[in-house]
């Protein structure tokens, strides 16, 4: 039995997968910040988690996926306000009783030290210093991401 949040996440991810391939992104769009091979957009307004998920989708992006502790720290370094929380693309899957990224993968328990409960209708937010479990209905800011296309150097055969 999937929760409404899980259904929303799956629907949006599937619709993103169905869309036609777009040319690779070489530079971050205006107002997006580059962090390594990603472009990040930090919202200024607030939304519940599922609206944030939908908003990123309309921007041809996704809620932030964090690969490891190192990426978390670098992302947190871009947060300029101490007390402000941002949704990322991680929520609690009731059916699998585990934290699940919106791309379908499960959280490696070593990656993030989450403060708060792992339970139904819980979604993950980050601040400048911590990672929190919040009710998904809480209205806070959010972070969208777009992947940058790596520029490969052309290799010319010996002349």
């Amino acid at each position: 039995q999937k929760s409404s949040i899980e259904k929303c996440s799956v629907d949006i991810q599937q619709s993103r997968n169905k869309t036609t391939e777009r040319p690779g992104l070489l530079n971050c769009p205006i107002y997006w910040q580059q962090l390594r091979e990603k472009c990040l957009l930090f919202s200024h307004t607030v939304n519940p988690w599922n609206n944030s998920l939908a908003d990123c989708s309309t921007k041809e992006s996704s809620l932030l996926l964090i690969r490891d502790k190192d990426e978390l720290i670098h992302t947190q370094n871009l947060i300029r306000d101490k007390a402000i929380l941002f949704w990322i693309g991680l929520n609690f899957s009731l059916s699998e009783k585990n934290w699940k990224w919106i791309n379908g993968s499960f959280l490696n328990s070593n990656d993030l030290e989450i403060r708060g409960d792992a339970k139904e209708n819980s979604c993950i937010s980050i601040s400048q210093t911590s990672v929190y479990s919040e009710y998904c209905s809480t209205e806070i800011r959010w972070i969208c991401q777009k992947e940058l296309t790596p520029v490969r150097n052309k290799v010319y055969p010996d002349s």
Epitope: L41, H44, A54, D55, D81, I84, E139
Partner: antibody, heavy 117, light 110 residues
């Protein structure tokens, strides 16, 4: 280059409703916030409210009871309705693009609205 | 939420610098890094000069810079030019339902 153009009546009678439309050209209306701002003659700017292309809205608390906003993505337009107009509502009304919900990077040229019987 | 406080006027000779202050509270300027600045020439729409306290949109000369300390934000125009003569307004996010502007400052190039 994104351009915004306000349209609507220049004269409104007291107690009537002001209806303004902003047409966006040179770019898509989607995935942005769109705001209305007004400026009485010789005075400062006042934010009225914003609408997102999903239709969600936020309004300045003191004006909330009188304001309605709507968006028509198919026409690349968004609209403002301000009820129970009084002389204090006489101002130049601007529409503006609000990319992240806290600042305005493209503005219409403004339309003067006078409230008078 | 009342308007942010700006000095009514500021002036400087060509080539000099002028700094405009914008004072709010911990609920607006002090609470967020979402301060912006606008330039308005008579009879024209405002133009964005600075956003997120200190970021400059493309096309805005680097003579314009923004900063913030506590509840007060500042706009500095260095190397003042005749075309910089205008009204300047600050603005700050206050909450999801409120965005406040400053009272405005008239900058005169002497």
């Amino acid at each position: 280059q994104v351009q915004l153009q306000e349209s609507g009546p220049g004269l409104v009678k007291p107690s009537e409703t002001l209806s303004l439309t902003c047409t966006v050209s040179g770019g898509s209306i989607s995935s942005y916030y769109w705001s209305w701002i007004r400026q009485p003659a010789g005075k400062g700017l006042e934010w009225i409210g914003r609408i997102y292309t999903s239709g969600s809205t936020n309004f300045k608390p003191s004006l909330k009871s009188r304001v309605t906003m709507s968006v028509d993505t198919s026409k690349n337009q968004f609209s403002l309705k301000l009820r129970s107009m009084t002389a204090a509502d006489t101002a130049v009304y601007y529409c503006a693009r609000d990319p992240l919900g806290s600042f305005f990077d493209y503005w219409g040229q403004g339309t003067l609205v006078t409230v008078s019987s | 939420q009342s308007a942010l406080t700006q000095p009514p006027s500021a002036s400087g000779s060509p080539g000099q610098s002028v700094t405009i202050s914008c004072t709010g509270t911990s609920s607006d300027v002090g609470g967020y890094n979402y301060v912006s600045w606008y330039q308005q020439h008579p009879g024209k729409a405002p133009k964005l000069m600075i956003y997120e306290v200190s970021k400059r949109p493309s096309g805005v000369p680097d003579r314009f810079s923004g900063s913030k300390s506590g509840n007060t934000a500042s706009l500095t125009v260095s190397g003042l030019q005749a075309e910089d003569e205008a009204d300047y307004y600050c603005s700050s996010y206050a909450d999801i339902n409120n965005l406040v502007f400053g009272t405005g400052t008239k900058v005169t190039v002497l």
